[in-house]
């Protein structure tokens, strides 16, 4: 009899008739930038402090009638979803509300900026515990709003935002498109993307994960004891803000990068029906629905990785696409993908003192994506080893020769337009796991890392007959760090990681024929950290 | 609204006297860029966020804002500084005619200017 959304985010070990997970976020303060709120509602009374901040535009229309309960509706509901006593996610979290949206739910980029600045100044004047900022709003892409979010995130604040309700690419909206912000799409009780009238939840590579966002029961501003059901990506973002508050209360030292990785790791995987999304967005959109971790501690031993897709390169011949990891993350591998199959591979390169993943389009190609595998690897020392095209029949090889360095990913990049017209390379000899092998006319890049207790192994899955998709997964306890295809022939569209599975996509088999050209091998590099496991055991 | 415009005028007149001491040449280096919302109905022309380069101090932000007002006044335009940003991003929020954008982009310390736009509850 508990609301479906609370049941959905609760791991089975907490599930009973009641939703009472331990420690309800009491060490965390959640800032809400929204409409005004009804602070004496019984769900939030005494736990939401209404700040004196207000920056809103005038309501549209000369005959607009301001009705308090309508003005408070959106913000009250969201405050209830985050920390409501009886229908909230983080029942112990305290909140502060800033009014940046008027009675029609409309605000401005400038008002939101001033609100974010207010939060930063409050943080400087009176530093408290972890801060979560919930931005249940969206406007068009804004460089300045994204920049402000980036600055606040780098000051140690966790920002959570709505992906937007426009049934569109979230990257076209702000703050949803800001990489430092945790961007949340909405799903319903059937784990399907939420439809809202003719529109619905946004999607795409700028969405980090989804969360319940349809028919969400929460505080209604109509009366101090009323509840109402509301839908939208704001409600979804409020769930994630609540989950973040719970996680930060349990582990106050978590960085934004660690929190994001944990949110992804503990999400329900592959439950969303991707057919709802436009075809070109399916591969880019994370199939993740947020959930609370099954236990508030003990996740520290895991090697956490996530996949970051670049923006599309565009179709020009020399176009490139770049995928970047967050400042606290290590780029452990780099791959590329092109729907047309026309690409010139990818490489890891240094940019501003940090490795990035760059993919290269080919002549006649419709464009490429770069795909970075971004991991949390404390005390890591990673470098890229490159071998130029070998021109020898055995293909190009490169390995990690430094003592204590292990191979975490392989990339290959070529200048010729079509590798498929050349003889494919011989498969890599067995028993040489620290080695990347590629086409003789490609330069090969090995990502080699040294970190305490880091161990990696190569896992392959080859299919002799042509197939549109070949996958290989890392087993329990191991984390996928690298994903590539062998051999690098032209019919391979690219490789990318989905959770702990390496996916290699090929061109439609009907156009390929079943020659040896059709043979595709997916190569996964699976790693784990014994050091993290030991540290975790010592803590317990 | 009328009172506000009165303040507006007063502020501009007060700034005219400072105008002579301010050079108009922009800093050397990259040209500042102008950004606006791609969704036309969401645009709010007439209000602009002037973002200054990262290490700009509050005093420089205020000086740049005053310089813009002075130069605008000389061209017969009213401007109003609505907010000076510091703490997250250096810069200021200004109410002015779009005709002044070219002038504003040439001001020292300016990184980029963004036209204000609407955001909506989701």
């Amino acid at each position: 009899s508990i609301p479906w959304n609370l049941e959905r985010i609760t791991p089975p070990r907490y599930r009973a008739d009641e939703y009472q997970p331990p420690d309800g976020g009491s060490l965390v303060e959640v800032y809400l930038l929204d409409t005004s709120i009804q602070s004496d509602h019984r769900e939030i009374e005494g736990r939401v402090m209404v700040t004196d901040f207000e920056n809103v535009p005038e309501e549209d229309g000369t005959r607009f009638h301001r009705q308090a309960s309508k003005c408070d509706s959106h913000g009250t509901h969201l405050a209830g979803v985050v920390s409501g006593r009886d229908a909230g996610v983080a029942k112990g979290a305290s909140m502060r509300s800033l009014r940046v949206l008027n009675c029609q739910g409309k605000g401005t980029v400038s008002g939101t900026l001033i609100g974010l600045e207010f939060i930063r100044k409050s943080q400087l004047v009176q530093p408290v515990g972890p801060l979560v900022v919930l931005l249940p709003l969206a406007g068009g892409y804004s460089r300045v709003l994204n920049a402000a979010c980036q600055r606040l995130a780098r000051a140690g604040v966790v920002l959570v935002t709505a992906a937007g309700n426009f049934r569109d690419d979230a990257c076209l909206y702000s703050p949803a498109s800001a990489p430092e912000v945790i961007t949340v799409g909405a799903t319903n009780a059937q784990d399907q993307p939420v439809t809202l009238g003719t529109l619905g939840t946004n999607f795409g590579r700028c969405v980090d994960l989804f969360a319940p966002g349809e028919d969400i029961i929460g505080a209604s501003s109509d009366c101090s004891t009323c509840f109402v059901s509301q839908s939208g990506t704001s409600q979804a973002a409020a769930h994630v803000a609540g989950i973040a508050a719970m996680m930060l209360s349990a582990e106050p030292e978590l960085t934004l990068a660690e929190l994001r990785q944990r949110l992804i790791h503990f999400s329900a995987k592959d439950v969303i029906n991707e057919a709802w999304f436009p075809e070109d967005q399916r591969v880019l959109t994370p199939n993740l629905v947020a959930a609370l971790p099954p236990s508030t501690h003990g996740a520290g031993w895991q090697l956490f990785c996530r996949t970051v897709w670049s923006a599309h390169s565009g179709p020009t011949r020399m176009a490139t696409a770049v995928a970047r990891c967050a400042p606290d993350e290590e780029l452990l591998s780099c791959s590329s993908f092109s729907r047309s199959g026309k690409r010139r591979g990818e490489r890891m390169e240094a940019q501003g003192g940090k490795l990035v993943c760059r993919a290269h389009n080919a002549f006649g190609g419709e464009g490429v994506y770069a795909i970075a595998r971004c991991c949390l690897l404390p005390q890591a020392n990673c470098s890229v080893h490159t071998a130029p095209p070998a021109e020898a029949s055995m293909g190009t090889r490169v390995h990690c020769h430094q003592q204590g360095h292990v191979l975490t990913g392989c990339s290959s990049h070529w200048e010729v337009e079509d590798l498929g017209t050349h003889k494919p390379p011989v498969l890599r000899p067995r028993g040489q796991p620290n080695q990347c092998v590629g086409h003789r006319e490609a330069s090969i890049h090995a990502s080699c890392c040294h970190a305490p207790g880091l161990e990696c192994k190569v896992k392959e899955h080859g299919i002799p007959a042509p197939q549109e998709q070949v996958t290989v997964a890392c087993e329990e306890g191991w984390t996928l760090t690298g994903c590539s295809a062998l051999p690098g022939t032209s019919h391979v569209l690219g490789a990318y990681a989905v959770d702990n599975t390496c996916v290699v996509r090929s061109r439609d088999v009907s156009t390929t024929g079943s020659t040896s050209e059709g043979a595709v091998t997916a190569v996964a590099i699976c790693c784990r950290s014994r050091h993290l496991a030991q540290a975790s055991q010592e803590l317990q | 609204q009328e009172d506000e415009d009165g303040d507006y005028e007063e502020l501009v007149l007060a700034l005219r006297s400072e105008e002579d001491g301010l050079a108009e040449a922009p800093e050397h280096g990259t040209t500042a860029t102008f950004h606006r919302c791609a969704k036309d109905p969401w645009r709010l022309p007439g209000t602009y966020v002037v973002v200054l380069k990262e290490e700009t101090h509050l005093s420089q932000s205020e000086r740049t804002a005053r310089r813009l007002q002075a130069q605008a006044a000389r061209r017969g335009y009213l401007t109003k500084i609505l907010h000076v940003f510091h703490g997250l991003l250096p810069g200021f929020l200004v109410k002015m005619s779009g005709d002044l954008l070219e002038l504003a982009l040439k001001l020292p310390h300016v990184d980029y200017i963004e036209e204000d736009s609407s955001v909506f509850a989701q």
């Epitope: 009899s1 009886d86 029961i217 | -």
Partner: antibody
Framework: QLQLQESGPGLVKPSETLSLTCTVS??????????WGWIRQPPGKGLEWIGS???????YYNPFLKSRVTISVDTSKNQFSLKLSSVTAADTAVYYC??????????????????WGQGTLVTVSS | EIVLTQSPATLSLSPGERATLSCRAS??????LAWYQQKPGQAPRLLIY???NRATGIPARFSGSGSGTDFTLTISSLEPEDFAVYYC????????FGGGTKVEIK
């Protein structure tokens, strides 16, 4: 069907603490669908809401009585209790316990009171 | 605090007659108003909720109307068992009850 039964002393001395318990039968107190409330009625007068509690322990009190009221729940016994401190003759009343639909689960309906216990008279006198 | 004022304090009518009870709120309670019936020595019983909705098992002769600050409970034809005290209650801002209207036999 669901029944509520108030119990506790019928006589309390001024300045002492009034303690009452409500036992719920025919249904579980640990349901998200309901709050459990106390309401009183001084002799010959109208009704006054004292406060309510949710199965999780969340409490809501009448602002005018808040400083003196404590409501608690014992889900294992299917009971909830009222404590009213520093009583005076003005606290003499029939005390009712009642179920209140929470609204948290829409199917339960809006939050009005019913069913009620039959009430217990508490007299404050020395 | 929202104050509810009921009128008249006492209504003397005969069985079969129409009873009209009024409840006025000190500020708008929207439609968040209920009516209860209480007989001597018994607990109150919910009749009408959200201004006009009949509770389960309540006869059709009971009807509620109004919104904002003015509400009416109507008993179209009084039955002998309807003679009792009637209270209105709001939930717009926490819970308060009216002082009651006693419907007695004339």
């Amino acid at each position: 069907q669901l029944q509520l039964q108030e119990s506790g002393p019928g006589l309390v001395k001024p300045s002492e603490t009034l303690s009452l318990t409500c036992t719920v039968s025919g249904g579980s107190i640990s349901s998200s669908s309901y709050y459990w409330g106390w309401i009183r009625q001084p002799p010959g007068k109208g009704l006054e809401w004292i406060g309510s509690i949710y199965y999780s322990g969340s409490t809501y009190y009448n602002p005018f009585l808040k400083s003196r009221v404590t409501i608690s729940v014992d889900t294992s016994k299917n009971q909830f209790s009222l404590k009213l401190s520093s009583v005076t003759a003005a606290d003499t009343a029939v005390y009712y316990c009642a179920r209140e639909n929470s609204g948290v689960v829409p199917a339960a309906g809006p939050n009005w009171f019913g069913p009620w216990g039959q009430g217990t008279l508490v007299t404050v006198s020395s | 605090e929202i104050v509810l004022t009921q009128s008249p304090a006492t209504l003397s009518l005969s069985p079969g007659e129409r009873a009209t009870l009024s409840c006025r709120a000190s500020q708008s309670v929207s439609s968040y108003l209920a009516w209860y019936q209480q007989k001597p020595g018994q607990a109150p019983r919910l009749l009408i909720y959200d201004a006009s909705n009949r509770a389960t098992g309540i006869p059709a002769r009971f009807s509620g109307s109004g919104s904002g600050t003015d509400f009416t409970l109507t008993i179209s034809s009084l039955e002998p068992e309807d003679f009792a005290v009637y209270y209105c209650q709001q939930r717009r801002n926490w819970f308060t009850f009216g002082g009651g209207t006693k419907v007695e036999i004339k």
